[in-house]
Interface confidence: low
């Protein structure tokens, strides 16, 4: 007997051969006898099967002896064996059809689990075995599910259904709603205007919901809500927003944050979450302020840093094109007595500049500038 | 001063895999991640995705999907980057490259890996 | 896919030219862009990161300006180790993607 499987909502053709090359008689049952199509000299004509209207043959192909079986629009219990009798004998043609839909909707938040479930007709023993778009290959029978999705788990899920030898391939959109950044750092030095990004790792037509930025200073003992907003189709309008500091927000996708100027009181982190509407959960993204101040008192030449920086990164002052005068891997730094020059406050990671501030050490009869 | 230290030169056979490593010596294996670019003759760069050595997670440039694995041995501080079903088009140099994460650069590369692909 | 399109793709020069690149983003990448040299048979070597900021020992002469989507490598005045050539990267967003290149040759 052979075996033919069909996918749920597809479009499946059963063949049936006749060893004439001609149009003869013809009929389709199924396995309880009761007939689905056959033809009449060359008319279509159509039993009493839960089939009518789905049910359909080719015509133009029964001249050359071939009378197929087209079922529309298959359905899980249109799995059954179904039998062509022609020239006195029966093919038999077993269909199996089945099914595989993700358990919710397939826009999924960064962490949410995804549950694919396998629909499948009675009997049936099939196996299925899912690769995500990052390649990663997961296995199972009625149900597979994937915790933890992360961002490259966006995209297309190729599914492979195996049973008596054949398989049948399902390919199933999944959007991982996440920001493109879990986090950022932004380096500034103080009075500079600071930009924060936030952009979104997806595209929807419509995207509604509400969002807000928390902010943890270092200096503060506890964080605070610097600005509320709601996202109407991908429009942006601001709900409530602190007085200090005075951020201004972008009105359009992606979110987007200025600061008017860095201030060592604004350095730390913080946390901006974002709430879609019908779906549960949050989107976070969080963002880092460090901020560096170089500063001459009297015979004192201090340099500074504020904010979350690792404990790797080097903060230095030098002279400009001279070897660093003082470089350690702390907060601040300062040189006593600095002799007259551009001095550079450099922050760095290896070698790399992360954020730098000069200052001019004039001759000791006068006062400082700051470029 | 970190160093990327590649493994020797490679010739395949169409349809086989090559698995190349990169040694990280001289620094933090963990902080950063590692990425791989790839080079073929006469051709620019192209990315085909990176590596977290602290955590395992990985992110392949979607040309690479399902053909491309990266894994890492934190304990003797290697990263390593597989590419399976090889076609002649896969003849280029492959490199690994310090990756400071996204919004940054590469700034220390590994000395390159011919991978010659032919039957 | 961010494409960033790299012009020219060669150029000829001589020794103490002032030489300009440029790279052009398919979007805003805000200041997400750095700029490599490679020389034959050698890795690249990070010149330009965050679109202007100087490479720790990479001489003064090469300078990076631009942010969204337009962006140069200058070069004030040639020398006969700049003979290269020369890729703009953007880090903006993964996939990370490199321009086509600049091959630097001696006029």
């Known amino acids: 007997k052979k075996v033919v499987l069909g996918k749920k909502g597809d479009t499946v053709e059963l063949t049936c051969t006749a060893s004439q090359k001609k149009s003869i008689q013809f009929h389709w049952k199924n396995s309880n006898q009761i007939k689905i199509l056959g033809n009449q000299g060359s008319f279509l004509t159509k039993g009493p099967s839960k089939l009518n209207d789905r049910a359909d043959s080719r015509r133009s192909l029964w001249d050359q002896g071939n009378f197929p079986l087209i079922i529309k629009n298959l359905k899980i219990e249109d799995s059954d064996t179904y039998i062509c009798e022609v020239e006195d004998q029966k093919e038999e043609v077993q269909l199996l059809v089945f099914g595989l839909t993700a358990n919710s909707d397939t826009h999924l938040l960064q962490g949410q689990s995804l549950t694919l479930t396998l629909e499948s007709p009675p009997g049936s023993s099939p196996s299925v075995q899912c690769r995500s778009p990052r390649g990663k290959n997961i296995q199972g029978g009625k149900t597979l599910s994937v915790s933890q999705l992360e961002l490259q788990d966006s995209g297309t899920w190729t599914c492979t259904v195996l049973q008596n030898q054949k398989k049948v391939e399902f390919k199933i959109d999944i959007v991982v709603l996440a920001f493109q950044k879990a986090s950022s750092i932004v380096y500034k030095k103080e009075g500079e205007q600071v930009e924060f990004s936030f952009p979104l790792a997806f595209t929807v037509e419509k995207l509604t919901g509400s969002g807000e930025l928390w902010w943890q200073a270092e200096r503060a003992s506890s964080s605070k809500s610097w600005i509320t907003f709601d996202l109407k189709n991908k429009e942006v309008s601001v709900k409530r927003v602190t007085q200090d500091p005075k951020l201004q927000m972008g009105k359009k996708l992606p979110l987007h944050l200025t600061l008017p100027q860095a201030l060592p009181q604004y350095a730390g982190s913080g946390n901006l979450t974002l709430a879609l509407e019908a779906k549960t959960g949050k989107l976070h993204q969080e963002v880092n302020l460090v901020v560096m101040r170089a500063t001459q008192l009297q015979k004192n030449l201090t340099c500074e840093v504020w904010g979350p920086t690792s404990p790797k990164l080097m903060l230095s002052l030098k002279l400009e094109n001279k070897e660093a005068k003082v470089s350690k891997r702390e907060k601040a730094v300062w040189v006593l007595n600095p002799e007259a020059g551009m001095w550079q406050c450099l922050l760095s990671d290896s070698g790399q500049v992360l954020l730098e501030s000069n200052i001019k050490v004039l001759p000791t009869w006068s006062t400082p500038v700051q470029p | 001063q970190v160093q990327l230290v590649q493994s020797g030169a490679e010739v395949k056979k169409p349809g086989a895999s090559v698995k190349v490593s990169c040694k990280a010596s001289?620094?933090?294996?963990?902080?950063?991640?590692i990425s791989w670019v790839r080079q073929a003759p006469g051709q620019g760069l192209e990315w085909m995705g990176r590596?977290?050595?602290?955590?395992?997670?990985?992110g392949y440039a979607q040309k690479f999907q399902g053909r491309v694995t990266m894994t890492r041995d934190t304990s003797t501080s290697t990263v390593y980057m597989e590419l399976s079903s090889l076609r002649s088009e896969d003849t280029a140099v492959y490199y690994c490259?310090?990756?400071?994460?996204?919004?940054?650069?590469?700034?220390?590369w590994g000395q390159g890996t011919t991978v010659t692909v032919s039957s | 896919d961010i494409q960033m399109t790299q012009s020219p793709s060669s150029l000829s020069a001589s020794v103490g030219d002032r030489v300009t690149i440029t790279c052009r983003a398919s979007?805003?990448?805000?200041?997400?862009l750095n700029w490599y040299q490679q020389k034959p048979g050698k890795a690249p070597k990070l010149l330009i990161y965050?679109?202007?900021t100087l490479q720790s020992g990479v001489p003064s002469r090469f300078s990076g300006s631009g942010s969204g989507t337009d962006f140069t490598l200058t070069i004030s005045s040639l020398q006969p180790e700049d003979f290269a050539t020369y890729y703009c990267?953007?880090?903006?967003?993964?996939?990370?993607?490199f321009g086509g290149g600049t091959k630097l040759e001696i006029k």
């Open positions: 979007q805003s990448i805000r200041t997400y």
């Open positions: 001289g620094g933090t294996f963990s902080s950063y991640a």
């Open positions: 965050a679109a202007s």
């Open positions: 490259a310090r990756d400071i994460g996204e919004g940054y650069s590469m700034d220390v």
């Open positions: 590596i977290n050595p602290n955590s395992g997670n990985t």
């Open positions: 990267q953007q880090s903006y967003s993964a996939p990370l993607t």
